[in-house]
């Protein structure tokens, strides 16, 4: 499936939209809002109860060449002893993003668009319980 | 994809850098991916620090909606059930690439942007500060 | 905290928190409060280190905070007061909020100070 249009009636097409070969489309990778600041709290991947570590991926066909994922670091929780408590689950928090996928093609490149599923950090959870009949 | 011809000494003219603009195919690797997360899990209302999830709709962005996580308590749900504020529930935040109509309404005309969104809650232990 | 007390609909009160300098070294300063058989909620935060404010949309225009950091003192000027306010009234700081998102990630609470207001 395809980015969908802005066909709905509400939209016009502007005579200012810039010519683009069918099947394509034009992406500028200057991005906007680069620098924003982002502000987090504090070390919530060690302080958390579902704690997680960071591995950074990196690809040089790919844009963003950068891309951290996380991981959880226990199945269980950490409970108020500092103790793993395997009644409870540590599970992945993830997100989706989009990513320039740069392909060689004999001397030629080409450029895709692409998802990729970001693990973000970790949550305790309460296990699902399935009761045998 | 659509190719792009490289430079004459192709072999040896290999560039690192991504150009400033490029043209990509329409069709995106890996799109069907479930997008909706009250869909791929629940665990926004099992988590110990559970998070409501807000549809944010921009007609000019790909993908139009995004789900915003707000976590639902200062504190997070200890094994009674109950909210305990000796341990709080803070949002798992994330930048990500979405595309931005450019110039704006342009159907096949876009400019990557960096947005930070709150993707769904943990709970951490508060920092303390020890008195000296 | 101190200010808190009892007053009729449409008064005013000023809350005032005394917090030791740990406190200020969070990234912000607020407000939580708790109605009876309610949860605590972040009505109202401010950055220690000037900056954005935070109103929760049920007391913009009547609350107003400030701080003077000199005096390591946050103040809490509640105006318009109405019966849904009466809760008990923490002094908060934290890591985390902005002028879009209360107060959270606290690590100082206050002991509370009692606000009821009357019809």
């Known amino acids: 499936r395809k980015i969908p249009k802005v066909g709905h009636t509400f939209f016009q097409k502007p005579e200012s939209c810039p010519p683009v070969p069918g099947g394509s489309m034009k992406l500028d990778i200057g991005i906007i809002n680069e620098n924003q600041r982002v502000s987090m709290s504090r070390n919530i991947e060690s302080r958390s109860t579902s704690p997680w570590n960071y591995t950074v991926t990196w690809d040089p066909n790919r844009y963003p060449s950068e891309v951290v994922q996380a991981q959880c670091r226990n199945l269980g929780c950490i409970n108020a002893q500092g103790k793993e408590d395997i009644s409870m689950n540590s599970v992945p928090i993830q997100q989706e993003t989009l990513v320039v996928r740069r392909k060689h093609q004999g001397c030629s490149v080409s450029f895709q668009l692409e998802k990729v599923l970001v693990t973000v950090g970790c949550t305790c959870v309460t296990p699902v319980i399935h009761h045998v009949q | 994809g659509i190719t792009i011809p490289r430079n004459p000494g192709c072999p040896n003219s290999e560039d690192k850098n991504f150009p400033r603009t490029v043209m990509v195919n329409l069709n995106i690797h890996n799109r069907n991916t479930n997008t909706n997360p009250k869909r791929s899990s629940d665990y926004y209302n099992r988590s110990t620090s559970p998070w409501n999830l807000h549809r944010n709709e921009d007609p000019e962005r790909y993908p139009s909606v995004i789900w915003e996580a707000k976590c639902r308590h200062l504190g997070c749900i200890n094994a009674d059930g109950n909210v305990d504020y000796h341990m709080n529930s803070v949002p798992i935040q994330q930048e990500i690439l979405v595309l931005r109509r450019e110039p704006p309404h342009c159907p096949n005309s876009f400019r990557l942007e960096k947005i930070l969104v709150s993707v769904g809650c943990t709970c951490v232990t508060p920092i303390v500060h020890h008195v000296a | 905290e101190s200010g808190g007390g009892s007053v009729q609909a449409g008064g005013s009160l000023r809350l005032s928190c005394a917090a030791s300098?740990?406190?200020?070294?969070?990234?912000?300063m607020g407000w939580v409060r708790q109605a009876p058989g309610k949860e605590r909620e972040g009505v109202v935060s401010i950055g220690t280190r000037g900056g954005s404010t935070y109103y929760a949309d049920s007391v913009k225009g009547r609350f107003t905070i400030a701080q003077d950091n000199a005096k390591n003192t946050m103040y809490l000027q509640m105006n318009s007061l109405k019966p849904e306010d009466t809760a008990m009234y923490y002094c908060?700081?934290?890591?985390?909020?902005?002028?879009?998102?209360?107060?959270?990630?606290?690590?100082?609470w206050g002991q509370g100070t009692q606000v009821t207001v009357s019809s």
């Open positions: 908060a700081a934290g890591l985390g909020g902005d002028s879009r998102t209360p107060i959270y990630d606290i690590s100082y």
């Open positions: 300098e740990y406190a200020w070294r969070l990234n912000r």
